[in-house]
Each structure stands twice: as structure tokens, then as C-alpha cells.
């Protein structure tokens, strides 16, 4: 299953990065799981994941650094709390969970660049 | 003549970006000109330029947004005063001016990403 995501995104100076993950669904899935993976060197780690019913909202766990909304075959993902050290390749993984058959789709990754802000001068 | 430069550089939150431009000199040049070009869409504009004698310092004009140092066949370039709207491809062009023959080398460009900082809160 094909998954498209932007090649590059810049995090805001507040450490927030948003991008769209779009998938070409081969069937009529009712339950979809979206996972954001971070690839550094050859290590792949899970950043966040959410399962949603088509037509319903995308809900990440309360302590997740991700939020998102879904519309048809598009998922708008936002990752917060990013620091310069979090710069890296963020891969969107989409799984059509129900009904069978299961389908897997993995995007090519979005390179997110994060720049730490300069501290503001102390107010006297 | 081959010119190497990094593919991507992030400007600091103060709008400063630095990168190295390295050239493979085919001869014993004594006078070298370095130009930074910005490519946006199909438009190429000159950002700054400096001519230097091998072994001497690289001197840009006083009102230039560029500064730099040279060491052998390497030039360390710094561009200041960058804003988010200045994000783009910055190409390093090197010309061996003297003695003849003249040589031209153009790098593949460095994508410089610039994020505007959040304004600091007003001090009351």
C-alpha cells in the first residue's frame, strides 16, 4: 500500500512540526492504525501510534507527543516538544487493521529539522 | 573543476548559517574568487562575492551579509541576517582567476533552512 509524506518539514521555533501522511487504501478499511517511527542510523524507534475508526477522530494517548486529525485517506500529524537533538527522519506507517486482509504501508520518511531557540534575555 | 559543499545546513535561531566550500584545484592558483549564489525557482541571484590571494584572508565588502575564511582549497562561508523567507538553495561558485588558465567550478548547492524565532515576551 502506497503512503505519501513530505520529504522535508521545519519545526517551528516552539518545537512543533506538522505534516500530512496520505495513503492509497486498496480496500474499504474501517479501522486504521497510524504510527510515527523515527529512524536514526539504522535504528527505528516508535514515536507514537494511534488507531482510529474511519470517520472518527484520531486519538493518541494522553502522554503522547503527537496529535492528529484524519480526513478520508489523509492524516494530519503534529509532533510537539521537539529539540534540535530530535532532528531526523520521521516515517509514517499506516496499517489497515480491519476488516481483513491486513495491509501495510510505509512512507519514505519526512526529514524534520529542529533548531533550538535562543533564550530570551532576562527581564530586569 | 569540482566543488563540494554540504547538501543541507540549518541556520541558527539568530539567522546565521555556515558551511564549507571545498574545491579541487587543478593548478597553482594565486588568485581565487568565491561567489555565493541563491537559486529560487529557476532564478539565480548573487548573494555575495569575494576575491582573495592564496594564503591571505577572504574579504567581502563591508555591507555584505557574508563573511569567510580560507584555508588551502577550503573556504568557510558564513551568511548572516537570514529570515525564513531566505530559505533556499545556496550555490558556491569558485573561479581560479590567476594565473591563466581560468577555471570555473560550481557546487551542487546547499539547502539552507531558516526558521524565524518567536518574539520574546515584552518586559513590563
Amino acid at each position: 500500500m502506497h503512503v505519501a509524506q513530505p520529504a522535508v518539514v521545519l519545526a517551528s521555533s516552539r518545537g512543533i512540526a506538522s505534516f500530512v501522511c496520505e495513503y492509497a487504501s486498496p480496500g474499504k478499511a474501517t479501522e486504521v492504525r497510524v504510527t510515527v517511527l523515527r529512524q536514526a542510523d539504522s535504528q527505528v524507534t516508535e514515536v507514537c501510534a494511534a488507531t482510529y475508526m474511519m470517520g472518527n477522530e484520531l486519538t493518541f494517548l494522553d502522554d503522547s507527543i503527537c496529535t492528529g486529525t484524519s480526513s478520508g485517506n489523509q492524516v494530519n500529524l503534529t509532533i510537539q516538544g521537539l529539540r534540535a537533538m530530535d532532528t531526523g527522519l520521521y516515517i509514517c506507517k499506516v496499517e489497515l487493521m480491519y476488516p481483513p486482509p491486513y495491509y501495510l504501508g510505509i512512507g519514505n520518511g519526512t526529514q524534520i529539522y529542529v533548531i533550538d531557540p535562543e533564550p530570551c534575555p532576562d527581564s530586569d | 573543476m569540482h566543488v563540494a559543499q554540504p547538501a543541507v545546513v540549518l541556520a541558527s535561531s539568530r539567522g546565521i548559517a555556515s558551511f564549507v566550500c571545498e574545491y579541487a584545484s587543478p593548478g597553482k592558483a594565486t588568485e581565487v574568487r568565491v561567489t555565493v549564489l541563491r537559486q529560487a525557482d529557476s532564478q539565480v541571484t548573487e548573494v555575495c562575492a569575494a576575491t582573495y590571494m592564496m594564503g591571505n584572508e577572504l574579504t567581502f565588502l563591508d555591507d555584505s551579509i557574508c563573511t569567510g575564511t580560507s584555508s588551502g582549497n577550503q573556504v568557510n562561508l558564513t551568511i548572516q541576517g537570514l529570515r525564513a523567507m531566505d530559505t533556499g538553495l545556496y550555490i558556491c561558485k569558485v573561479e581560479l582567476m590567476y594565473p591563466p588558465p581560468y577555471y570555473l567550478g560550481i557546487g551542487n548547492g546547499t539547502q539552507i533552512y531558516v526558521i524565524d524565532p518567536e518574539p520574546c515576551p515584552d518586559s513590563d
Epitope: E31, A49, M97, Y102 | -
Partner: antibody, heavy 118, light 107 residues
Framework: QVQLVESGGGVVQPGRSLRLSCAAS????????IHWVRQAPGKGLEWVAV????????DYADSVKGRFTISRDNSKNTLYLQMNSLRAEDTAVYYC???????????WGQGTLVTVSS | EIVLTQSPGTLSLSPGERATLSCRAS??????LAWYQQKPGQAPRLLIY???SRATGIPDRFSGSGSGTDFTLTISRLEPEDFAVYYC?????????FGPGTKVDIK
Amino acid sequence: QVQLVESGGGVVQPGRSLRLSCAASGFTFSSHGIHWVRQAPGKGLEWVAVIWYDGRNKDYADSVKGRFTISRDNSKNTLYLQMNSLRAEDTAVYYCARVAPLGPLDYWGQGTLVTVSS
Amino acid sequence: EIVLTQSPGTLSLSPGERATLSCRASQSVSSYLAWYQQKPGQAPRLLIYGASSRATGIPDRFSGSGSGTDFTLTISRLEPEDFAVYYCQQYGRSPFTFGPGTKVDIK
């Protein structure tokens, strides 16, 4: 380190039942799908079943559908395969294997032998 | 179901030689294809995933290529420990399927 250990294999008569277990350690169990894959003596690998994440979504090979049930207990980091109405052709080494974040099976157990014979 | 066909069934080679193994899918699996190595009495070991990415700890003499329906596993110079059975597997959709395997044995 990641470890998967199968147990529960043995000799069983045709038509009877057996339950295999797979104890997982060294990773966040609930974040991974887990497969059962089997290998008949001298034969190749055959996919049997998979269970995903919280255990609600499962898939089976046609050859075991209606006879085998895959389940998991995320609180115990354990995977199960309940095998009913066993046949001689179910004789195999049964492996559990973890699904890597990008989809392949990156860690496998050592396998447990199930022999269905009268 | 996606059927995977591997060829040859057996490959007889000497240490130091190059091994080229083929896997063909009955329909496109994009790049969702993995290669595994299995030695007698052992569990399979992941070598290649995503058609061409080497798994952690796998020597660079192993390489994978291809996409869609035709895939290749290449072992550039066979070491004694490389003589084993190699399986391809598609993991892009269920039912998940394995190829029948290629045995690489010593000539």
C-alpha cells in the same frame, strides 16, 4: 535483549487439542504484532497466524482457520496458540516471531515441536 | 494470496564464489519483502527487509535488490557459514507468505 521462548509442544493424537505459549521479554510487548510460523519436518516455512498490538485484530492461514485460535495476554507478555482438531499435517516445529517496526520478522523463538500421531 | 516462487531450488557453489538467489511474486508486493537465512536445527534469521535494507548485524556481503514482483538476494563472496537455506517473505498484506526456499550448498 529481545527474547521469545515457545513451550507446550509434544505428541498428540489426531483430533485432540494442544496449547502453545510464547513468553516474550526485552521489549514493549504491546507495541508489536506477533506471528506463529511453522515448519514441517524437512519442509519450508509456513505462516500460521498473526495477532496485532492489543489483541483485537487477528489473521489466519486458510489451512488452520476455524481450528486454531491466536491470543495474547499483554499483562503477562505472553502469546498463545490454541490448536484444536489437530491433523497429521499439523506436525511441525512452531515458531513465534516478532514483527519489527518496519514490518519483517526480526526476532524468532527457538521453536517447539508438535507431533500429531496416533 | 500472493505466491512467492524462488529459484533455483538448490545452488551448489564453492566458498568465495558469488551467489545470486531469485524470488518472484505473483503480484506486486512493492518493497515489502524480506529474506531470511536458516541453518539446520536453528530458527530463521532476518537478513534483508524492505527488499534492500540489511538487518542489524548482517555482514555487507549480503545485499538485496528489486521491487514489485522481482527480487534478488546476492551474497558477494560465500563464507563457510553462509551455506544454508534462504527464504523470501512478503509482509505487505495478509495472508503473509514465504517462498519455498533456496538451498545453498557446498559444491
